[in-house]
């Protein structure tokens, strides 16, 4: 007989998720309405395509990217979809409450859906560090806390530091990475004897993870340009992101071969490193004046990503209990920091060019912004980790980590595991 959820979780999860969904429906009923001013239907379709790209990135890209575990591929894809669906709903409400609410109802536009999808993407990046060790009820908590923390961070940064939509959303890489790592640090770490094989990758799931990486690779220019204000900015962002991810693919594959004693290419390195350029270039993608700079950035990002994938997993596995194939967390933390440093360099060049004493102040503001993002990510991540450790969530036992059969019905299986 195949394994089931413990009875208490079977009672807890549907109740918790459906109650939350009912609460969200009520909030939408009382506090939201659609933007009624859409005169140009052709423009509406064009604008929707950006949101569609982001949804493809989230649902297919990040969904499949995290599906490389031998016995946890179903859960990775479906739980990602579940978190995306829930996260978008809560992010739309939260963004509306934080930015529009004083004027009355929250107006839902395609732009607010775009923002919400990007906020939900943060959870999908973070969750890579904990997938396989938590159940859906715990993931609901993680979605709510992370989307709330990110929404508040963006609001604070927007008000205190005067940053625009793009700039404050580009903290998502660093925020999501540190949030995920701090949650992972709080969860039970050691894998008991006999379950080590479950966090290993398998050929077919690894292929689907590569498919996820390909979708992310294709749509990363859309992600980096989605919140930019003018066509010239979007054009620059798309071009620079494309050049950066193109070079990081070449670097990832050749660097992976270089890093292996027999010159073999590691699937795990490639899954992650192909995206490196897009993350590193994110903050300043619209500002980079020529392709060669974006390409150099892609090269550096690819090398950092491969180097990180080679040397960091051991440390992360010991300290945080993150399996070798879940390298998105530390990858994004390094590359996100690289992106922020590049922007600070641009700030320095700008203020030096202005020839005044503003340089220290502007750099300080930028470092303050980055520090705030990291601090809020760590604090909210630790809070989430502590919440996830509560007994009420009936977390899977360590022996049942990274196992689809804990969560899914497989009719063809005669016996449990």
């Amino acid at each position: 007989m195949s394994s089931k959820y413990p009875r208490s979780v079977r009672r807890c999860l549907p109740l918790w998720a459906l109650t939350l969904e009912a609460a969200l429906i009520l909030l939408f009923y009382f506090f939201t309405h659609y933007d009624a001013s859409l005169e140009d239907q052709k423009g509406l379709v064009a604008s929707y395509q950006v949101g569609q790209d982001l949804t493809v990135m989230a649902a297919i890209g990040l969904g499949f990217l995290t599906s490389s575990f031998r016995r946890h591929s179903w859960s990775s894809v479906a739980f990602n979809l579940f978190m995306l669906a829930l996260g978008v709903q809560w992010a739309i409400l939260l963004d509306g409450f934080l930015s529009q609410f004083p004027s009355g109802k929250v107006v839902i536009t395609l732009f607010s859906i775009r923002l919400a999808t990007m906020s939900a993407l943060s959870v999908l990046i973070s969750v890579d560090a904990v997938l396989g060790k938590v159940n859906l009820a715990q993931l609901v908590v993680m979605v709510l806390v992370e989307v709330t923390a990110l929404g508040n961070l963006r609001m604070v940064i927007s008000n205190i530091f005067n940053t625009d939509y793009h700039m404050n959303m580009m903290h998502i890489y660093v925020f999501a990475a540190y949030f995920g790592l701090s949650v992972a640090w709080c969860l039970p770490k050691p894998l008991p004897e006999g379950t080590e094989d479950k966090d290993q990758t398998a050929t077919i799931p690894s292929l689907s993870a590569m498919l996820g990486a390909l979708f992310l690779w294709m749509f990363w220019p859309s992600f980096n340009s989605a919140l930019l204000r003018s066509p010239i900015e979007r054009k620059n962002a798309v071009f620079n992101t494309y050049y950066a991810v193109a070079v990081s693919v070449v670097t990832a594959i050749s660097g992976s071969s270089l890093a292996h004693p027999q010159g073999k290419i590691s699937k795990t390195y490639v899954h992650s490193a192909v995206l490196a350029g897009g993350v590193a270039v994110g903050t300043s993608c619209h500002l980079i004046p020529s392709p060669w700079l974006a390409m150099v950035l892609g090269l550096v990002a690819g090398l950092i990503s491969v180097g990180g994938a080679k040397y960091l997993p051991g440390c992360c596995n010991r300290v945080l209990g993150i399996p070798h194939s879940s390298i998105m967390g530390y990858n994004f933390s390094l590359l996100g920091l690289l992106g922020e440093i590049i922007y600070i360099v641009l700030l320095v060049l700008d203020t030096v060019g202005a020839g005044n004493g503003m340089i220290g102040f502007q750099v300080l503001l930028s470092i303050g912004e980055l520090s705030l993002a990291i601090v809020i990510a760590l604090m909210s991540g630790l809070l989430t980790g502590l919440l996830l450790n509560l007994k009420i969530w009936k977390a899977p036992h360590e022996a049942k980590y990274f196992d689809d059969q804990v969560f899914w019905k497989f009719p063809h299986l005669a016996v449990g595991f």
Epitope: G43, T109, D164, I232, L287, L347, L349, D350
Partner: antibody, heavy 125, light 106 residues
């Protein structure tokens, strides 16, 4: 030649509604963000609202939030400002203006390089 | 908040005229200058603190960064009368204009 022309102004009672239109010509309208700026009699300029080039994002000055709605129809080269619950303090000349962007080293600078002639809105009982 | 000074000035043809604009917090170089004549729409003079808009005479110049900005007319001409406004675009979406400086010809 690049031109913006407002219409739809007039006299309206407090609490009433009015819709201003602005037709653009001589440039690719869909490639530019657009703004409404107003000027009360004998007063300075006050920025009112903006809309992104693709209509996906909008912003308003606090005093008109929830009452005014900016929109655009790129297929007709038209910009609109729907004004509801009008108050006496909304009396002004309303200008539509085109936004242009210039890349700096660490950020973009935006400016209003083309302005319409203005439409007069009078709110009075 | 953008504060312009003086609020009005009278100058003779050929004079050097300076108008200052102070921001309550840094706007880097995200500042524009406009000229408005009575009954007319505003006209862009300078953007990004110091870049002259095409078609604007070279006697107009802008300088400054951070919180303090200056518009200078090197040699005032009869057609330069009107009201001059500074405007920041650093804090988007809430753009703000200065209260204006009225320039009259003596």
């Amino acid at each position: 030649q690049v031109k913006l022309l407002e219409s739809g102004g007039g006299l309206v009672q407090p609490g009433g509604s009015l819709r201003l239109s602005c037709v653009a010509s001589g440039f690719t309208f869909r490639s530019y963000g657009m703004h409404w700026v107003r000027q009360a009699p004998g007063k300075g300029l006050e920025w009112v609202a903006f809309i992104w080039f693709d209509g996906s994002n909008k912003g308003y000055v606090d005093s008109v939030k929830g009452r005014f709605t900016i929109s655009r129809d790129n297929s007709k080269n038209m910009l609109y400002l729907q004004m509801n619950s009008l108050r006496a303090e909304d009396t002004a000349v309303y200008y539509c203006a085109r936004e242009k962007a210039l890349r700096g080293i660490s950020r973009y600078n935006y400016y209003l390089d083309v302005w319409g002639k203005g439409a007069t809105v009078t709110v009075s009982s | 908040v953008m504060t312009q000074s003086p609020s009005s000035l009278s100058a003779s043809i050929g004079d050097r005229v300076t108008i200052t604009c102070r921001a309550s917090q840094s706007v880097t170089r995200s500042l524009n200058w406009y000229q408005q004549k009575p009954g007319k729409a505003p006209r862009l003079l300078i953007f990004a603190a110091s870049t002259l808009q095409s078609g604007v005479p070279s006697r107009f110049s802008g300088s400054g960064s951070g919180t303090d900005f200056t518009l200078t007319i090197s040699s005032l001409q009869p057609e330069d009368f009107g009201t001059y406004y500074c405007q920041q675009n650093y804090r988007t979406p809430q753009w703000t204009f200065g209260q204006g400086t009225k320039v009259e010809i003596k």
